[in-house]
């Protein structure tokens, strides 16, 4: 029975040309974690394996940054990157979870941050 | 087993630079993050900030970072710091850390000693 | 920035002794991770995700906690515990530690 949850960055918003943290976190179980895959829509950002390191994906080897913990740091924004993007935890023996976050990047100098990651 | 080696104490002139390596061997370099720590005995454990050797992507600590310089050679597998302007406060023990799964730093070099004299 | 702070700054246990130190940080954090250090040699992570023990760290450790309040245990002390350890987290840049507890065999 998976009991897990996955908490969120939720919402979020960045200006172009800056830089966002893509933070999950597993609570509620006692799962082993044995990989985190980062993706945007159907694309793989990264992969972060329990006994091999993080691998980035070509296309964005330029501009991340592994980290914070098992997240994300995606900088030199554009308005492309705007969308969708997902954490898919592999536990064993829970299985998979997934989380989500929606990232608008803009172009304005009005950006804020949305629901900042803290566990309640 | 991951290794971290790095290399030997340093006696610097205030103003000038120093850079000092930390090769890595036993596990794939261009993986992991690399951390960098300075220990003074009045401050204890701080963080200067990281690179990524598989894209040299860094980030780096507020406080250092008009201070340090990160670079890594993954053909070499070894990361560099370099620290600039030098003054009696940067005098201190400078440790490279490998960062594991989940954020924790792993394996720790044995430290470069930093002394900045007048 | 997530400040961590520790207490006892020095405390002191004899062999056999329960000993409890903690971790508060500033902003909740998902994980601590803790490491001890003897004079002379560089820290070693000893404790990571709260509560996993590094591999060769005696079963007599352990460490529990959540959001802010962290702690670290020892069960019963022995001379070789004698050591400062630090807290550290990673939930935001920058990545910060606790100021250390020293502790020492009485």
């Known amino acids: 029975m998976m009991t897990g949850t996955i908490e969120t960055t939720g919402n979020i918003s960045a200006e172009k040309g800056g830089s966002i943290i893509l933070q999950c976190h597993l609570s509620s179980t006692t799962a082993q974690v044995t990989q985190v895959n980062w993706e945007q829509q159907d694309q793989l950002l990264a992969i972060c394996n329990a006994d091999l390191g993080w691998h980035i994906s070509p296309s964005f080897k330029d501009r991340v940054a592994p980290g914070p913990g098992l997240g994300l740091t995606l900088q030199s924004l554009t308005v492309n990157d705007t969308g969708e993007y997902f954490c898919i935890y592999h536990t064993y023996p829970d299985g998979t979870y997934t989380g989500r976050i929606f990232l608008e990047v803009l172009e304005s100098s009005v950006a804020e941050h949305g629901a900042r990651f803290q566990i309640p | 087993q991951a290794y971290l080696q790095q290399s030997g104490a340093e006696l610097v002139r205030s103003g000038a630079s120093v850079k000092m390596s930390c090769k890595a061997s036993g596990y794939t370099f261009s993986n992991y993050n690399m951390h960098w720590v300075k220990q003074t005995p009045g401050q204890g454990l701080e963080w200067i900030g990281y690179?990524?050797?598989?894209?040299?992507?860094?980030t780096y600590s507020q406080k250092f970072k008009d201070k340090a310089t990160l670079t890594a050679d993954t053909s070499s597998s070894t990361a560099y710091m370099q620290i600039s302007s030098l003054t009696s406060e940067d005098s201190a023990v400078y440790f490279c850390?490998?960062?594991?799964?989940?954020?924790?730093?792993?394996?720790w070099g044995q430290g470069t000693s930093v002394t900045v004299s007048s | 920035q997530i400040v961590l702070t520790q207490s006892p700054e020095i405390m002191s246990a004899s062999p056999g002794e329960k000993v409890t130190m903690t971790c508060s940080a500033s902003s909740s954090v998902s994980h601590m991770h803790w490491y001890q250090q003897k004079s002379g040699t560089s820290p070693k992570r000893w404790i990571y995700d709260t509560s996993k023990l590094a591999s060769g760290v005696p079963a007599r450790f352990s460490g529990s906690g959540s959001g802010t309040s962290y702690s670290l245990t020892i069960s019963s002390m022995e001379a070789e515990d004698s050591a400062t350890f630090y807290c550290?987290?990673?939930?935001?840049?920058?990545?910060?530690f606790g100021a250390g507890t020293k502790l020492e065999l009485k």
């Open positions: 850390a490998r960062g594991g799964f989940g954020g924790a730093l792993d394996y």
């Open positions: 690179i990524f050797p598989g894209n040299g992507v860094t």
């Open positions: 550290q987290q990673w939930n935001n840049n920058p990545l910060t």
